[in-house]
């Protein structure tokens, strides 16, 4: 079972119209450059076999991967949105730094690894796709962690 108190984000993080709008604008801008619409990174398959109480921990892993392997390397693109959205997501990541689950998380890591593998396999277009799904990342964090 997750240590719930640490796998939580305050609702106020998702009620800031300006940064929410910038996050969604960034996602839209990137999705215009994504021509592989059949592949979804964040969706039903990511959550398959993961209980509701474990989903915030799962999304923490996805958030950290997105920041470190996608947003930081692509930080010069999609301005001015990127320079505002990355610090916002980094703050959420920092607030989830103590979110862990007790016991076996292999099923979670397996799902996250599939997402990572898909991004890596697609190369730069995988990174663009991940940026294009920042609205889904935002919603998933909101749904799982508040």
């Amino acid at each position: 079972a997750p240590i719930s108190s640490h796998c939580r984000l305050d609702k106020s993080n998702f009620q800031q119209p300006y940064i929410t709008n910038r996050t969604f604008m960034l996602a839209k801008e990137a999705s215009l450059a994504d021509n592989n619409t059949d592949v979804r990174l964040i969706g039903e398959k990511l959550f398959h076999g993961v209980s509701m109480s474990e989903r915030c921990y799962l999304m923490k892993q996805v958030l950290n991967f997105t920041l470190e392997e996608v947003l930081f390397p692509q930080s010069d693109r999609f301005q001015p949105y990127m320079q505002e959205v990355v610090p916002f997501l980094a703050r959420l990541s920092n607030r989830l730094s103590t979110c862990h689950i007790e016991g076996d998380d292999l099923h979670i890591q397996r799902n996250v690894q599939k997402l990572k593998d898909t991004v890596k396999k697609l190369g730069e277009s995988g990174e663009i796709k991940a940026i294009g799904e920042l609205d889904l990342l935002f919603m998933s964090l909101r749904n799982a962690c508040i």
């Epitope: 059949d38 592949v39 979804r40 039903e44 398959k45 609205d135 919603m139």
Partner: antibody, heavy 119, light 107 residues
Framework: QVQLVESGAEVKKPGASVKVSCKAS????????ISWVRQAPGQGLEWMGW????????NYAQKFQGRVTMTTDTSTSTAYMELRSLRSDDTAVYYC????????????WGQGTLVTVSS | DIQMTQSPSTLSASIGDRVTITCRAS??????LAWYQQKPGKAPKLLIY???SLASGAPSRFSGSGSGTDFTLTISSLQPDDFATYYC?????????FGGGTKLEIK
Amino acid sequence: QVQLVESGAEVKKPGASVKVSCKASGYTFTSYGISWVRQAPGQGLEWMGWISAYTGNTNYAQKFQGRVTMTTDTSTSTAYMELRSLRSDDTAVYYCARDRGYYDAFDIWGQGTLVTVSS
Amino acid sequence: DIQMTQSPSTLSASIGDRVTITCRASEGIYHWLAWYQQKPGKAPKLLIYKASSLASGAPSRFSGSGSGTDFTLTISSLQPDDFATYYCQQYSNYPLTFGGGTKLEIK
């Protein structure tokens, strides 16, 4: 090309059941789900529920809970919607639509199946 | 359930007109809104998703805007093929819900 093809029109008596099929082609069936939407004559669109072609998980509108069953057959890339205990106000065109089920609009629709419930 | 209120329910316009249809959600739905066009006897067709993204194959004269609770569909210059019924739909929360529709008629 990507398409959804539904079964033909049905005429049923009140109290009977109907099972409508929706055959998908042109895409990976298990990468998406199927929503079912109905439209009574001269009326608007009404969402009935969704089924995942990947897991078989379902999400039904409360109005249809206990009366509708949605299933898929991945071997034939076909989705099914069964509605039981039919009433005259179930007379409608029933559409299937492609839908990932996670913040996704309906980008591909079937042609619709007219179900008429009449004694 | 999230209620979707479309206005007007009927709209008369002429070829070449700029037309706007509005849709209001009973609670915030971010940008999870789609617009569909339906012609008599046919299945609906996706025009706009994520409030403002143009669907594949949809003419560029269609555009969408808005976020939160208030949304608009705009047709920049009405063509003969555009006379149809238009529906908005929210896909932020289950159950998914549609607006009541706007019938666009020839003036």
